[in-house]
Interface confidence: medium
Amino acid sequence: KVFGRCELAAAMKRHGLDNYRGYSLGNWVCAAKFESNFNTQATNRNTDGSTDYGILQINSRWWCNDGRTPGSRNLCNIPCSALLSSDITASVNCAKKIVSDGNGMNAWVAWRNRCKGTDVQAWIRGCRL
């Protein structure tokens, strides 16, 4: 599923991401835009043999199990395929664990490079939330 900007903002708010660990909703929508272009089925392979999955591009080396990443920790205790569902519950729950891990949203490279320090509220402007 490819979400609309405001559709995703509403879904993320429903799942409790607004101000989760101090990160406003705009940060999460911005991260999703530049990680996956709002596509729940996005997959991207990394040079270390791991793969990033879903709307927030969650990595199989640490957070989920795709059955083929050497040394996978699966800290979210889920199959990576669950992160590709049109229902973003699994991605959100795992993202909450990631953002609580100490580095905050710096765990997402796209957020660090494209969203951090910018007017992230622009990503939810005009949305009826």
Epitope: Q41, T43, R45, G67, L84
Partner: antibody
Framework: QVQLQESGAEVMKPGASVKISCKAT????????IEWVKQRPGHGLEWIGE????????YYNEKFKGKATFTADTSSNTAYMQLSSLTSEDSAVYYC?????????WGQGTTLTVS | DIELTQSPATLSVTPGDSVSLSCRAS??????LHWYQQKSHESPRLLIK???QSMSGIPSRFSGSGSGTDFTLSINSVETEDFGMYFC?????????FGGGTKLEIK
């Protein structure tokens, strides 16, 4: 137990297309990548690409882009590979395998003859 | 693409001999190297995963070693059922690649 059952041997004319199937049983089909491998005598084993059935995400070896197309039907736990514009170079045994980095589970192979 | 070169192409041995098969990668692949045995008209069978981890049901005479670019499959005291083709495969990067194979034949 995990099993991958491939469709039977095919004899095709040059220029035609063929669709090979791989039915998976004994595990959660949507969770694991299905890989496709080509074997020709004297050419060893070649990785064609892969599909994640749960999402339809696919990756292809550059060499096989435009030649192979992967699909999956999660209702029947079956993965498919279509090969188009067949030539004699496509005559080979084609295997599906479950993608665990390594390949522990293999189909029995489908022999394709183009002549 | 990572190229895997296996040597020798053919190895002629007598049952009871011990042998070593080599697989060399064109660049470092850490320990992401797997070994398969294939007999005529059969699917490949996984012997060793991640360089040295033996699969259950595989006889203990098969062992693997190496790291980086140089890997070895050793068969301690070859038995008649061991004859066939042996392939290595890397899972360090895409596309996945296989070695050209070593044929183990009876002398």
């Amino acid at each position: 137990q995990v099993q991958l059952q491939e469709s039977g041997a095919e004899v095709m004319k040059p220029g035609a297309s063929v669709k090979i199937s791989c039915k998976a049983t004994g595990y959660t089909f949507t969770t694991y990548w299905i890989e496709w491998v080509k074997q020709r005598p004297g050419h060893g084993l070649e990785w064609i690409g892969e599909i994640l059935p749960g999402s339809g995400s696919t990756y292809y070896n550059e060499k096989f882009k435009g030649k192979a197309t992967f699909t999956a039907d999660t209702s029947s736990n079956t993965a498919y590979m279509q090969l188009s514009s067949l030539t004699s170079e496509d005559s080979a045994v084609y295997y599906c395998a479950r993608g665990d980095g390594y390949y522990y589970y293999w189909g029995q192979g489908t022999t394709l003859t183009v002549s | 693409d990572i190229e895997l070169t296996q040597s020798p192409a053919t190895l002629s041995v007598t049952p009871g001999d011990s042998v070593s098969l080599s697989c060399r990668a064109s660049q470092s692949i850490s320990n992401n190297l797997h070994w398969y045995q294939q007999k005529s008209h059969e699917s490949p069978r996984l012997l060793i995963k991640y360089t040295s981890q033996s699969m259950s049901g595989i006889p203990s005479r098969f062992s693997g070693s190496g790291s980086g670019t140089d890997f070895t499959l050793s068969i301690n005291s070859v038995e008649t059922e061991d004859f066939g083709m042996y392939f290595c495969q890397q899972s360090n990067s895409w596309p996945r690649t296989f070695g050209g194979g070593t044929k183990l034949e009876i002398k």
